[in-house]
Amino acid sequence: WPPPGTGDVVVQAPTQVPGFLGDSVTLPCYLQVPNMEVTHVSQLTWARHGESGSMAVFHQTQGPSYSESKRLEFVAARLGAELRNASLRMFGLRVEDEGNYTCLFVTFPQGSRSVDIWLRVLAKPQNTAEVQKVQLTGEPVPMARCVSTGGRPPAQITWHSDLGGMPNTSQVPGFLSGTVTVTSLWILVPSSQVDGKNVTCKVEHESFEKPQLLTVNLTVYYPPEVSISGYDNNWYLGQNEATLTCDARSNPEPTGYNWSTTMGPLPPFAVAQGAQLLIRPVDKPINTTLICNVTNALGARQAELTVQVKEGPPSEHSGISRN
């Protein structure tokens, strides 16, 4: 219907605008008029899809009128000025504000020109990750927990680990209406090898510039795993002192080391020094099985080592340490 040459007047606006719950947001909307075109704007109108009436109107002589005057404001439209900018500010965003809005210009001689804008109401979630301290169970159990609280829409949680494991993710309504709290558990069969290793919780959300990465240091409580080192099956009479070490991995840390032999207490040539056992030089061959017993809060475990001190001069390359 408009006269020839008037088809180029268009309304410019983004198709989608994000805004944060409780904050204010501007819905941008402009009338784009090419240089050679003539247009006169008398009214700016905002309406929400599915609702009766308009929520905001800027009239050439009456100025602005709003359905909710405390929550809406024309950003740039002024009485006596050209009405080319219909941008509307919304204050105190609520979940129910999410939806489709129409921005409309009443123009002459082109007629009405409008565009639709989708307002997306977001809530930025708070993210935490924590270890779930476990004992050896033989069954898969949650070993780490990642929580994204109060997001809109719900955050996406994924786990990254070289250890395998399975996620178990659930959602519940957040404290604020329309928000969601997402909880993800990382599940694995606990083992001592996993203790102290890291897994990463990755949280993705529309409101983040980039994903948030939260690292969890795993904790597995287990009794001591014990071995004895320092013996190379190549000890001879007349050699200098040697040292055996009781190597224990445990969580929590060992609380005590106890050295003994299968025959009972340590012989005189063996002196216990905590996790180490000092072997003094001997003048006759021996064949003794030594025991290291390590205790932590979860129990005690032991390791045995049979030590032989043989006759004959030590070779240049005997494998024992000399002091």
Epitope: H40, S42, G53, H59, Q62, F108, P109, G111
Partner: antibody, heavy 116, light 107 residues
């Protein structure tokens, strides 16, 4: 105070033309589009067309098939409507009206009677 | 052209009555609807713009509502000076069109 004052009544013969004036005051003439609406006696309102005084841009109701011409004189803040090839069914009160999307101010009306 | 169908075409009511006039558009006009009051021998006077917003100086007993295709003008408590004809108008697209009018008489 915004005022739109129209010229007086006209009696015309079929086939003739009529030109009605609408002198404005109380506002900046070039900031508002001027439209014309007619109303046959005891009947409804019919939009004829509009003109933007600044650039002379016009829009017409196709029903008038090129019989109507809208013009302005910016120096006197006056709008004009000329209707040609008059017929008896053009007998009506013709109004000028200031456009604000709707029409917020109207002239007092000019009665045009077409009769042989 | 968009056809605006107004009803009733005429009605009478008593002072203090609540009066409702409706206007139906033949296609979606959003909220681009105005209402006018025309007293005998006078030009129309603008009451409502954008379907629901009152012009300054218009008594608040006049209320407009609606969007899309269905619109209503309500006079909450009729006064003697409201004796007039009422018209709706769409300004969504050219050619602008009016309802045929509702003549309101006072009983």
């Amino acid at each position: 105070e915004v005022q739109l004052v129209q010229s007086g009544s006209e009696l015309k013969k079929p086939g003739a033309s009529v030109k009605i004036s609408c002198k404005t005051s109380g506002y900046t003439f070039t900031e508002y589009t001027m439209h014309w609406v007619r109303q046959p006696h005891g009947k409804g309102l019919e939009w004829i067309g509009g003109i933007h005084p600044n650039q002379g841009e016009t829009s017409y109701n196709q029903r008038f098939k090129g019989r109507v011409t809208l013009t302005v004189d910016k120096s006197t803040s006056t709008a004009y409507m000329e209707l040609s090839s008059l017929r008896s069914e053009d007998t009506a009160v013709y109004y000028c009206a200031r456009w604000t999307g709707d029409f917020d101010y109207w002239g007092q009306g000019t009665l045009v009677t077409v009769s042989s | 052209d968009i056809v605006m169908t107004q009803s009733p075409s005429a009605m009478s009511a008593s002072v203090g009555d609540r009066v409702t006039i409706t206007c139906k558009a033949s296609q979606n006009v959003g909220t681009n609807v105005a209402w006018y009051q025309q007293k005998p021998g006078q030009p129309p006077k603008a009451l409502i713009y954008s379907a629901s917003y009152r012009y300054s100086g218009v008594p608040d007993r006049f209320t407009g509502s609606g969007s899309g295709t269905d619109f209503t003008l309500t006079i909450s408590s009729l006064q003697a000076e409201d004796l007039a004809e009422y018209f709706c108008q769409q300004y969504e697209s050219y050619p602008y069109t009016f309802g045929q009018g509702t003549k309101l008489e006072i009983k």
